[in-house]
Structures are given as structure tokens and as C-alpha cells.
Amino acid sequence: AVNGTSQFTCFYNSRANISCVWSQDGALQDTSCQVHAWPDRRRWNQTCELLPVSQASWACNLILGAPDSQKLTTVDIVTLRVLCREGVRWRVMAIQDFKPFENLRLMAPISLQVVHVETHRCNISWEISQASHYFERHLEFEARTLSPGHTWEEAPLLTLKQKQEWICLETLTPDTQYEFQVRVKPLQGEFTTWSPWSQPLAFRTKPAALGKDT
């Protein structure tokens, strides 16, 4: 939802969290603002305090319940408002009717680990976190490997078009330090976006055996 120079963007993690970012040009830095969530079908509502993340943007997380509880469904619509204090009153700065399963961003994958490493290849696995059982296999992943002397932005993206929580990296250089990241996205939702990248997993390929042609 956009009001003039105001932008209000929220995503549902598919379980019990709605994360929101509100940006407003010329907004007062010392104003107290919050996001208020009012579902159309539920008897709970939730508020979080917007905290500055840059000169003109604020963010907060609406914690709807226990991390793995399924607090919203595809039928729910949540009215989300940005409220800022003006004296003794609260002023509505932005508002949107939020459809959770059209605006998904899952948590970053966790528990990355090296399953097996060789001189030229490495098998890595991970787990998804706080993802609705609704998705079943309807997820896709992107992965990237950081090679020495390169940046993450330069790393080619590897796409896994199915729910596959492992990857075998090939054509690696022996005895070399690498880092690996993965992210996940449900196939559902018009405004759904990729999760944040996972924490990088550092690993080192095995050295080539002496006297062997590599």
C-alpha cells in the first residue's frame, strides 16, 4: 500500500510472523509508530513497534503466536495499519488489506551442513524453518557458492525447481575454501518473494592426492 511518498510492505512467513517495512520521505525521526494487525476472522489482534532501519524506513515483526503455529490460512485477510503518535492521538499513516498467502517470504533455511566432501565436489544439506505444512513439495530453492577472490553478487545462482533440501556441488577446486548459501520460495502467492539467504556455510575441499593428476 502506497500513500504519496509512503510505502508499506509486509510478508507472512507462512506460520506465525508478519514482517513489515514502512518507508516515508520526510517522516519525523522521533515519532513513535507501530504496525497494527487486525484479522477479519480471528479474535486476536497484534501490534509491533516500528524501529528505524535507515534514514526514512522502519521495520517490525508481528509475532502472532508460537513459531510453528499456523496462525493464518489462505482464507484470512488481515488489515494492517501504520499508526504514528501525534500528541495524544494515533494517526493512520498507511493501511492495506493483507492476504497472507499472496505475500509470502519464508524464513531463511537453517542447519546447513556438509554431508560429504571430496576434492572436486561437496554434498550439502539444509532444513527449512517455520514453513507451513501446506506447501508440501511446492517449494523451490536457489543456492550460490562463494569462490576465492569473488563476491556473493558474482556467484552464479543454482536453481532447484523442487523441494530438494540438498545439493551436490561439482567441479570444485581441490584444497580450496568456499562458502555456500541457500534460500527458499513457495510457488504460491502473487507477491511472494525469496526468503533471506541462509547463514553462509564455510567448507574446504580435500587436497588432491599426491602424485595424482588433477
Partner: antibody, heavy 120, light 106 residues
Framework: EVQLVESGGGLVQPGGSLRLSCAAS????????MSWVRQAPGKGLEWIGE????????NYAPSLKDRFTISRDNAKNSLYLQMNSLRAEDTAVYYC?????????????WGQGTTVTVSS | DIQMTQSPSSLSASVGDRVTITCSAS?????MHWYQQKPGKAPKRWIY???KLASGVPSRFSGSGSGTEFTLTISSLQPEDFATYYC?????????FGGGTKVEIK
């Protein structure tokens, strides 16, 4: 104790109209979504439609929305179903049901039902 | 609309038997709910959110499943369990019910 009591059923000719009522007690009616559900003789359950607490949102089964209208009066703790252009296939027991939500959405209380017979 | 297919449509079983009723959805659903209905009576909420027993429902009942396949299980059938059981989804509008499974005495 939560109670839902339907009334207004009866025998009506094809093409006729009928208005069903559901009287609610034992809970704060004005806070709950409500639905109508019907069951034809010997058949399964069919959702008719729902209404939110302040009547600002009313949804219907696509096949019924042109002939059926749901309304409510929170001051009277009452839910209504106006049925027009009735057909023989509308013969059924009509239930009102209260919605509840834990994580999913379901019906936690049902009325005893009122029978509508459409026949000439 | 999401179509719900219950199987079997009816079954005959003896007291003490283990009974399993299956509900298949034509598309993925987040939760399945189950209702018990006895002749001439209104349905009663029986199992909600796939596996949670409604108040007063005996622990011999259980629910499970995800995606498109869900089950209601009675571990040891008792005389008061003879009834018709309906599954219901509300993961997308409109909510839909299965055709019902009638549990009869053998």
C-alpha cells in the same frame, strides 16, 4: 450454554420464497462470523454462505448467490436466510452454524435445523 | 472449488474394531476438520485443525494427514461411535464437505 435455534421452515411451492431465522443465545453473537449450511434428504452437507460480525462481508456458495441472501441483526441476536425462486432441489434441512478459529476455520456449534420442503 | 472425496462411503464394523476413514482433497489444504452426525441430529464438531479433538471427544479418536490426504481413525470402535462422519476444508473459499462415511454395526 451456546444455543442456536432455527425457525421458518415449511412447505413452499416451486418459485416461492421463504425466510429462515436463527436465534442465538449463550454467547456474544456480535463477535462471531456465522454461516448457513444445508443437507438434502439422505445427502451430505452443503455450505450456503457466511456473514461477518458487522455484516460488511457476506460470501456465498457460487451456485446459490443469485437466489439466497444472508443478513443478521446483532441487536436481536439473530441470523437470517432469505431464499427466493425456490426449486425442488432446495428441499433440505437448513442449519445455522457458528464459526470458530483455533488455527483453521470450522463450525463449532450448530442449530438443530429447520426443514424446508419445496413441492407443488 | 476444492472437491472432497471420502472413502469408504459406508462401512460395517464390530465393537472393538479399528476403523479408518480417509478424506482426499482435490487441492492442497492447510487443515481438515471432521464432524460426527447421528440420524435426525445436527452435526457436531469432532476433530478440528486436522488432529485436535473437540471437547468431550474420546481419546480413541485421532486425526492425521497433510496436503491432500487426511484420515480419521477410531482405535477401538464403541457402540456410541456408530454415526456418519464428514470431513470439511476451509483453506479456500468456498468451504466444502466430504460426502460422508456412515459407520454401521456389523
Amino acid at each position: 450454554e451456546v444455543q442456536l435455534v432455527e425457525s421458518g421452515g415449511g412447505l413452499v411451492q416451486p418459485g416461492g420464497s421463504l425466510r429462515l431465522s436463527c436465534a442465538a443465545s449463550g454467547f456474544d453473537f456480535s463477535r462471531y462470523w456465522m454461516s448457513w449450511v444445508r443437507q438434502a434428504p439422505g445427502k451430505g452437507l452443503e455450505w450456503i454462505g457466511e456473514i461477518n460480525p458487522d455484516s460488511s462481508t457476506i460470501n456465498y456458495a457460487p451456485s446459490l448467490k443469485d437466489r439466497f441472501t444472508i443478513s443478521r441483526d446483532n441487536a436481536k441476536n439473530s441470523l437470517y436466510l432469505q431464499m427466493n425462486s425456490l426449486r425442488a432441489e432446495d428441499t433440505a434441512v437448513y442449519y445455522c452454524a457458528r464459526h470458530d478459529y483455533d488455527e483453521g476455520i470450522y463450525f463449532d456449534y450448530w442449530g438443530q435445523g429447520t426443514t424446508v420442503t419445496v413441492s407443488s | 472449488d476444492i472437491q472432497m472425496t471420502q472413502s469408504p462411503s459406508s462401512l460395517s464394523a464390530s465393537v472393538g474394531d479399528r476403523v479408518t476413514i480417509t478424506c482426499s482433497a482435490s487441492s492442497r489444504v492447510i487443515y481438515m476438520h471432521w464432524y460426527q452426525q447421528k440420524p435426525g441430529k445436527a452435526p457436531k464438531r469432532w476433530i478440528y485443525d486436522t488432529s485436535k479433538l473437540a471437547s468431550g471427544v474420546p481419546s480413541r479418536f485421532s486425526g492425521s494427514g497433510s496436503g491432500t490426504e487426511f484420515t480419521l481413525t477410531i482405535s477401538s470402535l464403541q457402540p456410541e461411535d456408530f454415526a456418519t462422519y464428514y470431513c470439511q476444508q476451509w483453506s479456500s473459499n468456498p468451504p466444502t464437505f466430504g460426502g460422508g462415511t456412515k459407520v454401521e454395526i456389523k
